[in-house]
Interface confidence: low
Amino acid sequence: DGCKDIFMKNEILSASQPFAFNCTFPPITSGEVSVTWYKNSSKIPVSKIIQSRIHQDETWILFLPMEWGDSGVYQCVIKGRDSCHRIHVNLTVFEKHWCDTSIGGLPNLSDEYKQILHLGKDDSLTCHLHFPKSCVLGPIKWYKDCNEIKGERFTVLETRLLVSNVSAEDRGNYACQAILTHSGKQYEVLNGITVSITERAGYGGSVPKIIYPKNHSIEVQLGTTLIVDCNVTDTKDNTNLRCWRVNNTLVDDYYDESKRIREGVETHVSFREHNLYTVNITFLEVKMEDYGLPFMCHAGVSTAYIILQLPAPDFR
């Protein structure tokens, strides 16, 4: 059928809770494309009816919730004007007995569920919640060894748990929990995170590679809306933070009042050897003050910038 096959790594998932997977594969999905999801090489596409427990939501496949029988290989077919790519995703579902230590822990966890804190430093854990915009996520609660985390050293900031002055006692089994609302129904999302402590300073030894941007300028008309992706490849065990800054300040903080320029939600695609992360910056309306400023994408120790410039006048 002329489609190029791309195989993603296995995803190991907890039964009885929501799960979503976004069929994005930059740069394939950046243009005008159609995305269709299938299960186990079926010719019948996954339903697009939002009441269905499993359905396609734009480029996402959404399970509300995931169940035992959902294990299998799912394919999303990305068709462009002159191209076709078929991405294979192997989903394995298991039953997690959260606080029953007699049953044992999680199986081979995917890497976002293994995180590292650096001894003596201020560090953070990230709750990876990847869902389409039809899903509304409530505030996140954090647990350690099945007890809700409280204390002065811990601060919940959006999807992160900030830990100040990390100690050896901070290693262990964590979980983040959020209530997800979709079409008036509520579901609990729980991610288990195995946390280890390292004395190694810095960024876990990995230097992320920023694929885009490349320290360049972008021509953009005054008043237009602009979205720019920052694409980063990094090792699977990385603990690097990825964000957009301007004047050495997070864009969400810098434009806190107007909210005219915002950082998007980070997404990632897992490959066998590395992860590809995408976090965008959205200019709701480009203003004169934006021109000439370097907007910096940071990924650990790596940085890259874009500079907006007015298009050259057309004298024709």
Partner: nanobody
Framework: EVQLVESGGGLVQPGGSLRLSCAAS????????LGWYRQAPGKQREAVAT????????YYSDSVKGRFTISQDNAKTTVYLQMNSLRAEDTAVYYC?????????????????????SGQGTLVTVSS
């Protein structure tokens, strides 16, 4: 809007049985720890029995172990509490609770009450 509606309470003689039901609407239960707690006049509330959303694990307080059984229907939208060999000290208002994280200590016999939703309660009176 999430609603939990209890039923089945009433007056029963010591040694008798009752079956409480809790029907949920507007809520997808499957991932939650569901259960019952009770509060007698002038006493602290007590977790009586809980069941994980998948039905794979249950918890009973020592005071009801062997006498009470918690279960769910197949659709996991109704939770039952079968109460046998009732005693006078079982007299209390029984509340259905849901929306609690399965990580919350209440689900495993702890003393914190982190459930998100709770019903209006149904009175159980054990008296001769």
């Amino acid at each position: 809007e999430v609603q939990l509606v209890e039923s089945g309470g009433g007056l029963v003689q010591p040694g008798g049985s009752l079956r409480l039901s809790c029907a949920a609407s507007g809520y997808s239960y499957r991932t939650q720890c569901l259960g019952w707690y009770r509060q007698a006049p002038g006493k602290q509330r007590e977790a009586v029995a809980t069941i994980s959303g998948g039905g794979t694990s249950t918890y009973y307080s020592d005071s009801v172990k062997g006498r009470f059984t918690i279960s769910q229907d197949n659709a996991k939208t109704t939770v039952y509490l079968q109460m046998n060999s009732l005693r006078a000290e079982d007299t209390a208002v029984y509340y259905c609770a849901a929306g609690l994280s399965v990580l919350g200590s209440w689900c495993h016999g702890g003393s914190s009450y982190e459930y998100t939703y709770s019903g209006q309660g149904t009175l159980v009176t054990v008296s001769s």
